[in-house]
């Protein structure tokens, strides 16, 4: 058993049929010595008396808010949560496996630049009685500070019969140099509590590997005289690291109709303009990627050919 | 240590092309190592990230773009020299700060060159003959060093009398290649910045 936060404790249980469970001793936070009784949750049934209560925690029915009282007055609470371990593996029931970039990916993180600011998100089908707490650091043995905000519900989607909820959190490394060469990864730890179930999820990454620039901005077209070709130009996104001559981007320019199966014109360039062939009912799209370290491409920025 | 004096080639900035080739060569070599050594811990997640140049050179700090010198976090690690003006373009009056940056890059290349050559000598003794260093990568390191045009003491190649542990050597190769790729990215960024200056 360990303390998650004040008056909240996590009991780690090997979860299998007829498991013996864990013996837990609760102590009432009071100077009083006698006349103390214990109850669980909303029940008025007295579970025991005395300053300490010894319980055998085997299942979720044994978890919950234990309260010690004296003469009708509440003295203190202890909330017990369960963390299940099945076949030596901690449960991951609360969050959905996003399966990208690989299986067992519960947390996904992205950074728009090298400033040390990043966003992580996760998915769940659970809509109520759900809380998250996020901590982060650079390295684990001698951790350096990363400050994370509160996790918030950022999107709701309908997936077949199920509703899916996306939560996200923004974090900022306390003293980040955009030009630094990372040798210790960022560690992100998410504590998830659903009712009386506790789970924790972790992710470890270098900022350079989670870079995904914003789409290029200010796309403009200029038809070329006596030609099917148009010159398309754009600018670096405002959120990208500066100076741009140091943090350079490369671009992919594509002309395509509505359908992915349609024919297309495609060209890659390090410049902020390109010449392509425009077709009726097609659109020109441009996306960006770090020129020197191939992490993710940005989303497309698009303008219609006409 | 005496600072070597930079004498960049006249004409179009020569180092940019070589640094692009360097990044390409080390990326290809790393990809090849990951594929060939698939049963070894050779991915970014699996290896320890070591920097053989740590405390010996200060490329990131010495080559920091002027715009980032206002960022406290970029300056806190040690006495920092940064590029204040000039560029590796045709000018003979290369600034002292830039000479410091380019000499730091040169020292990096020299250290990695020695490590890679030593390692290759060991890998050539491996009866499995599983992986060797790409000669193109070694050639590209050499070309960039020549383009930087510094005169510095030659570092003797380390020779080892004991029987090499090929498993450890291959893991060390992965660690070196990952670190060198990150440094090659920095070098490419620096050259691109200088070229635009």
């Amino acid at each position: 058993i360990w303390e998650l936060k004040k008056d909240v404790y996590v009991v780690e249980l090997d979860w299998y049929p007829d498991a013996p469970g864990e013996m837990v001793v609760l102590t009432c936070d009071t100077p009083e010595e006698d006349g103390i009784t214990w109850t669980l949750d909303q029940s008025s049934e007295v579970l025991g008396s005395g300053k300490t209560l010894t319980i055998q925690v085997k299942e979720f029915g044994d978890a919950g808010q234990y309260t010690c009282h004296k003469g009708g007055e509440v003295l203190s609470h202890s909330l017990l949560l369960l963390h299940k371990k099945e076949d030596g593996i901690w449960s991951t029931d609360i969050l959905k496996d996003q399966k990208e970039p690989k299986n067992k990916t519960f947390l996904r993180c992205e950074a728009k630049n090298y400033s040390g600011r990043f966003t992580c998100w996760w998915l769940t089908t659970i809509s109520t009685d759900l809380t998250f707490s996020v901590k982060s650091s650079r390295g684990s043995s001698d951790p350096q500070g990363v400050t994370c905000g509160a996790a918030t519900l950022s999107a709701e989607r309908v997936r077949g019969d199920n509703k899916e909820y996306e939560y996200s959190v923004e974090c900022q490394e306390d003293s980040a140099c955009p030009a630094a060469e990372e040798s210790l990864p960022i560690e992100v730890m998410v504590d998830a509590v659903h009712k009386l179930k506790y789970e924790n999820y972790t992710s470890s990454f270098f900022i350079r590997d989670i870079i995904k620039p914003d789409p290029p901005k200010n796309l403009q077209l200029k038809p070329l005289k006596n030609s099917r070709q148009v010159e398309v130009s754009w600018e670096y996104p405002d959120t990208w690291s500066t100076p741009h001559s140091y943090f350079s981007l490369t671009f992919c320019v594509q002309v395509q109709g509505k359908s992915k199966r349609e024919k297309k014109d495609r060209v890659f360039t390090d410049k902020t303009s390109a010449t392509v062939i425009c077709r009726k009912n097609a659109s020109i799209s441009v996306r960006a990627q770090d020129r020197y370290y191939s992490s993710s491409w940005s989303e497309w920025a698009s303008v219609p050919c006409s | 240590r005496n600072l070597p004096v930079a004498t960049p080639d006249p004409g179009m900035f020569p180092c940019l092309h070589h640094s692009q080739n360097l990044l390409r060569a080390v990326s290809n070599m790393l990809q090849k190592a990951r594929q060939t050594l698939e049963f070894y811990p050779c991915t970014s997640e699996e290896i320890d990230h070591e920097d053989i140049t740590k405390d010996k050179t200060s490329t990131v700090e010495a080559c920091l773009p002027l715009e980032l010198t206002k960022n406290e976090s970029c300056l806190n690690s040690r006495e920092t020299s940064f590029i204040t003006n000039g560029s590796c373009l045709a000018s003979r009056k290369t600034s002292f700060m830039m000479a410091l940056c380019l000499s730091s890059i040169y020292e990096d290349l020299k250290m990695y060159q020695v490590e890679f050559k030593t390692m290759n000598a060991k890998l050539l003794m491996d009866p499995k003959r599983q992986i060797f260093l790409d000669q193109n990568m070694l050639a590209v390191i050499d070309e960039l060093m020549q383009a930087l045009n510094f005169n510095s003491e030659t570092v003797p190649q380390k020779s080892s009398l004991e029987e090499p542990d090929f498993y450890k050597t291959k893991i060390k190769l992965c660690i070196l290649l990952h670190a060198f790729r990150i440094r090659a990215v920095t070098i490419d960024r620096v050259m691109s910045y200088l070229n635009a200056s």
Partner: antibody, heavy 118, light 107 residues
């Protein structure tokens, strides 16, 4: 299976014109860009131009501009390349080729040898 | 027009050995470079698109690398059927242009 079948070999006199056909099968004709590329004996490949059969748009290499005309007939899934004012250096194998990507080629015809000789 | 220069023009290789062919552009073309294989009397066959993207149906022993002006096609272990002429093509701008070809022959 996408296939491009070209017309047979031709022998032409200098100053005359040649029209080579290329019939496509497999896949929708207008879903692809069609290119013409030639190869003189023992030489490399030389791109001549492309057509978008969907709208008839064409683009020609400056070297052939004014001498080459590329057309397409959607009803018969056939493309044509006509080269006029022939000279001996136009002796080559002419390939039609296609792709959904405009700038490179993934399917080639078998080639048509055009010999220009007096 | 962008000029594509291949080297060497002829490359004698022992079967089972690796081979590398170089292609250089007269100006920077990013990764807009494609590789083809051509056998005598046959049309070319696409091997690699955009410098390094593999094409389905092409054996994994063929790989490409490069960007800017310098590109390389690598065949990791030459098979008897790989003895042919290899051509690079730029698609950075029109007109599309090809290299003159590198003939890989049996040593």
């Amino acid at each position: 299976q996408v296939q491009l079948v070209q017309s047979g070999a031709e022998v032409k006199k200098p100053g005359s014109s040649v029209k080579v056909s290329c019939k496509a099968s497999g896949g929708t004709f207008s879903d692809y860009y069609l290119h013409w590329v030639r190869q003189a004996p023992g030489q490399g490949l030389e791109w001549m131009g492309w057509i978008d059969p969907e709208n008839g748009d064409t683009e020609y290499a400056p070297k052939f501009q004014g001498r080459v005309t590329i057309t397409a007939d959607e009803s018969t899934s056939t493309a044509y390349m006509e080269l006029s004012s022939l000279r001996s250096e136009d002796t080559a194998v002419y390939y039609c080729a296609r792709n959904k990507e405009l700038r490179y080629i993934d399917v080639w015809g078998q080639g048509t040898l055009v010999t220009v000789s007096s | 027009d962008i000029v594509m220069t291949q080297s060497p023009l002829s490359l004698p290789v022992t079967p089972g050995e690796p081979a590398s062919i170089s292609c250089r552009a007269s100006q920077s073309i990013s990764i807009n470079l494609h590789w083809y294989q051509q056998k005598p009397g046959q049309a070319p066959r696409l091997l690699i698109a955009f410098a390094s993207q593999s094409i389905s149906g092409v054996p994994s022993r063929f790989s490409g690398s490069g960007s800017g002006t310098d590109f390389t096609l690598t065949i990791s272990s030459l098979q008897p059927e790989d003895f042919a002429t290899y051509l690079c093509q730029q698609s950075n701008s029109f007109p599309l242009t090809f290299g003159q070809g590198t003939k890989v022959e049996i040593k």
